[in-house]
């Protein structure tokens, strides 16, 4: 009886794992084997394709051979017994467009209030992403194992650490990897599961917001109790980025080592121009807060986040407001080149209701206003990355009268 | 492969001061933070502290603030720790070992041993 | 400074048992601690880190668990080569503490 050749052969490839599966023709031919050739571009030659010679099983791994994962490799398989199939050809593909991103590798750290995600690639030194390592961005899915209510939390880097959890909770995620490049999103990790410890005696220090003052940055924080000392440490923004750095080297900033107020005080050329992770830690001289909420500080912004400039064009019933960019001391204007959200407050001169509108436009409409009154506006702008979390001081005040009532255009 | 190779044992006269020395290869060292621990005989492990070989910033145990100086030459991939004023209580086996992601130290040296006497 | 107490010195144990070593921290630190093997003449040897993940190449005899200030290091089917000495440490904050140690002996 003539041998059929297999059919519906799929390649599986997550990783350096290359995986061949296929169906049998022919289930009531005992005793069959299956063998592969491979075939690279450009060449007429068949090679024996090592690992899947010879197989009983509908199934084989090549992960052996060394290939070039961005070069296209056809393969094609026969059954034998006695005798052999004809063979049969698999479509032509190259393992770099075909492959999948395998599961990362997931480590958990606990805390009161948080947990510490460290994520590295599922395959070590993969020769598959040897270009792309350097790219990758990982999501994950959290939730709290009693309640299932998940949340999504994408782009994040080789370690996270999520915040504003419950103590003595026990929270469960998964983490998938993509790699944004070549658009390709990976196979989620196992469901890792840690429970976060009791309150720790010491909150951490909260709302740390730097300012600048003269030639020096000064560093506020809020905290819960007195007689305290703080420590503030600093890491370049650009490590978090780095997928091989499980080591975050953070430094002292020498002026905030064991300061017994709730702000420091140290001067700008401390840092250089750069982004910059900053957190808090307080003392009681027995006890040891965990680690504040890290906050980014860029150096550039927090030099030039000015207030900004405004006209504004009076109607009956409303004020369009045109907002520009500040101005520098010499007049000039400061191009800032991140996007800002403006915040804007106005009152009735003889009042001191104040209202706002937050808008991402530079073209505001104030409605609702009373004819032939006297409003005064004031702005601020912020920045809309919420890390960065900066604000400007507001502008000095400007009033202006509403026109007269048959006025609306 | 990663190791942590330590110089040989010392003997030494009390007062004097000895330099000990841990060479690494498998890593670079600029990319973790080395560490130095003490084992007394019949006596747990203490800590003396560590070093981050990239900018020489270091940290210590309390007790060991004046006692030990840990530094590291980056170009030969080696940290020292240098122990001053020594007594006899200074006689123990010095550990190297590096830190180097969240596994904390999972490579350690094969000890040098300082005999004051 | 952190405290971690191992409040017993020492463990008599019988081959194929299970032992569970203790120790506990004077305050909070999460799960950042890990357990060490010291055998006389040789090296530590990382058994445990973050609390409760085992390190390379450590038999899966040995468990660690615990969080905040209690942890533990349990060893089922204690097997001779398991006679040594177990430290706990702490890395969450400087200083870097170790406990005072637990050593494991055969009955």
């Known amino acids: 009886k003539n041998l059929k050749s297999p059919q519906k052969v799929e390649v599986d490839i997550i990783d350096d794992n290359f995986i061949l599966r296929w169906n049998r023709s022919d289930e009531s031919v005992g005793n069959v084997t299956f063998s592969f050739d491979y075939q690279k571009t450009g060449m007429d030659n068949w090679i024996k394709l090592s690992g899947c010679q010879n197989i009983t099983s509908t199934k084989c791994n090549f992960s052996s051979l060394k290939l070039n994962v961005y070069e296209e490799i056809k393969l094609r398989i026969r059954a034998e017994k006695e005798n052999t199939s004809s063979w049969y050809e698999v479509d032509s593909f190259t393992p770099f467009r075909k492959a999948q991103i395998g599961p990362p590798e997931v480590h958990l750290e606990a805390e009161d209030k948080a947990i510490v995600i460290h994520i590295s690639p599922g395959t070590k030194d993969s020769v598959m992403w040897a270009l792309d390592g350097l790219s990758f961005t990982y999501s994950l899915v959290i939730w709290k194992n009693s309640s299932g209510v998940e949340e999504r939390i994408e782009n994040i880097y080789s370690r996270h650490k999520i915040y504003k959890l419950s103590p003595e909770t026990t929270y469960c995620l998964k983490v998938k990897a993509a790699l944004l490049t070549s658009w390709k999103i990976g196979v989620y990790s196992p469901v890792h599961c840690i429970k976060t410890t009791v309150e720790n005696e010491l909150p951490p220090p909260e709302n740390i917001e730097v300012s600048v003052q003269n030639q020096n940055y000064v560093l506020k924080w809020d905290y819960t109790y007195a007689n305290m000392t703080f420590q503030v440490q600093w890491l370049h923004a650009f490590l978090k980025r780095n997928p091989g750095n499980h080591l975050y080297k953070w430094k002292q900033i020498p002026d905030c080592e064991n300061v017994k107020t709730t702000q420091c005080v140290f001067p700008q050329n401390v840092f250089q121009k750069g982004i910059y992770l900053l957190r808090v830690q307080a003392s009681d001289g027995n006890n040891t807060s965990f680690w504040s909420e890290e906050i980014k500080f860029d150096t550039e912004i927090q030099a030039f986040l000015l207030p900004p400039v405004f006209n504004i064009r009076s109607l009956s019933d409303s004020f369009h407001i045109y907002i520009g960019a500040p101005k520098q001391s010499g007049n000039t204007p400061v191009i800032q080149d991140y996007p800002l959200i403006y915040e804007i407050i106005f009152w009735e001169n003889t009042s001191n209701a104040e209202r706002k509108i937050i808008e991402k436009k530079t073209d505001v409409t104030v409605p609702n206003l009373k004819p032939l009154t006297v409003y005064c506006v004031k702005a601020r702008a912020h920045t809309m990355d919420e890390k960065l979390n900066k604000s400007s001081v507001f502008s000095d005040a400007v009033c202006e009268k509403t026109k007269p009532g048959n006025t609306s255009k | 492969e990663v190791q942590l190779q330590q110089s040989g044992a010392e003997l030494v006269k009390p007062g004097a001061s000895v330099k000990l020395s841990c060479s690494a290869s498998g890593f670079n060292i600029k990319d973790c933070y080395i560490h130095w621990v003490k084992q007394r005989t019949e006596q747990g492990l203490e800590w003396i502290g560590r070093i981050d070989p990239e900018d020489g910033e270091t940290k210590y145990a309390p007790k060991f603030q004046a006692k030990a100086t840990i530094t590291a030459d980056t170009s030969s991939n080696t940290a020292y720790l240098q122990l001053n004023s020594l007594t006899s209580e200074d006689t123990a086996v010095y550990y190297c070992?590096?830190?180097?992601?969240?596994?904390?130290?999972?490579?350690w040296g094969q000890g040098s041993t300082l005999t004051v006497s | 400074d952190i405290v971690m107490t191992q409040s017993q010195k020492s463990m008599s144990t019988s081959l194929g048992d299970r032992v569970t070593v203790t120790c506990k921290a004077s305050?909070?630190?999460?799960?950042?601690v890990a357990w060490y093997q010291l055998k006389p003449g040789q090296s530590p040897k990382t058994l445990i880190y973050?609390?409760?993940y085992r390190s390379s190449g450590v038999p899966d005899r040995f468990t660690g668990s615990g969080s905040g200030t209690d942890f533990t290091l349990t060893i089922s089917n204690v097997q001779s080569e398991d006679l040594a000495e177990y430290f706990c440490q702490q890395y969450n904050n400087y200083p870097v503490i170790f406990g005072s140690g637990t050593k494991l002996e055969i009955r």
């Open positions: 070992a590096r830190h180097c992601n969240f596994l904390y130290f999972d490579y």
């Open positions: 305050q909070n630190v999460g799960t950042i």
């Open positions: 973050s609390a409760s």
